[in-house]
């Protein structure tokens, strides 16, 4: 198991998350970017319901990170923001156990 790369392990965990499994499999409405504007403002973990990673591709030339907040609003976070990079790194390091915040990848239609 320790020979599996962390990115592969993260993807495996992503696909097997139980609390919100398959929520991104509903439908894919269009091939374009979803984020209108991005923020670098720090969002404490206690306010976050879910982090959604949309890799570059499928009509969007950039990577997008959507943070779903517990107050039922979303924020697109600048992937270059230090805090989100740190948080993603923590999630990767913990990927051998259970992810505290669900992370999802863009669905390929």
């Amino acid at each position: 198991m320790k020979f599996i790369s962390t990115s592969l392990l993260l993807m495996l965990l992503v696909s097997s998350l139980s609390p919100v499994q398959g929520v991104l499999e509903v439908y894919y409405t269009s091939l374009r970017c979803r984020c209108v504007q991005e923020s670098s403002v720090f969002i404490p973990r206690r306010f976050i319901d879910r982090i959604q990673i949309l890799p570059r591709g499928n009509g969007c030339p950039r990577k997008e990170i959507i943070v779903w907040k517990k107050n039922k609003s979303i924020v697109c976070v600048d992937p270059q923001a230090e805090w989100i990079q740190r948080m993603m790194e923590v999630l990767r390091k913990r990927s051998s156990s259970t992810l505290p915040v669900p992370v999802f990848k863009r669905k390929i239609p």
Partner: antibody
Amino acid sequence: QITLKESGPTLVKPTQTLTLTCTFSGFSLSTFGATVGWIRQPPGKALEWLALIYWDDDKRYNPSLRSRLTITKDTSKNQVVLTMTNMDPVDTATYYCARRLGQYDYDEGFDYWGQGTTVTVSS
Amino acid sequence: DVVMTQTPLSLPVTPGEPASISCRSSQSLLDSYNGNTYLAWYLRKPGQSPQLLIYRLSYRASGVPDRFSGSGSGTDFTLKISRVEAEDVGVYYCSQSTHVPYTFGQGTKLEIK
């Protein structure tokens, strides 16, 4: 296949409490992002949003009706219940329940609607 | 509450011709927090429940033909049908969910000439 169906009394007397049940299938209200809302349409008038309930039991109400409305869910029965107190003839309308399920946002519109149930308030 | 005003209220169209419905809100529907505009369009066909056509200003709902498109910004919005078909008859509603309470326009009745 996703379906929603409203049920409840067709005739209610003024001052009485209306209880409407939305029974749905094809999705679960325990799924992250799932929301069920209630919307009504009085005869010849515009649609009016009443309330909604999220998968995590968070709720939102139309402020103008907040004191009269209560929305609850029973995830195991796949049901959402709306109660409306102190009914008045102006509350005569077709009442719809509808589902919202966002893929990239909490709010991506009500994509499935019930057939609606007509409620008449009259003595 | 945000008032949604639609024009025209009645729209007779010849099949194959384009159609356009305007919707104006009494205040901006831009969510300054995330830059999104929570404006949707619904169609209620005769004898049916409303169906979602467009959400978040310009995203087509699943299964909606690409002849339908949504555009606009701030307080002025438009639903366009590039080529009207007989099955498009019904009442079209714009709806905003940027501000609570969510509100709907009074509807535009599209009919075939």
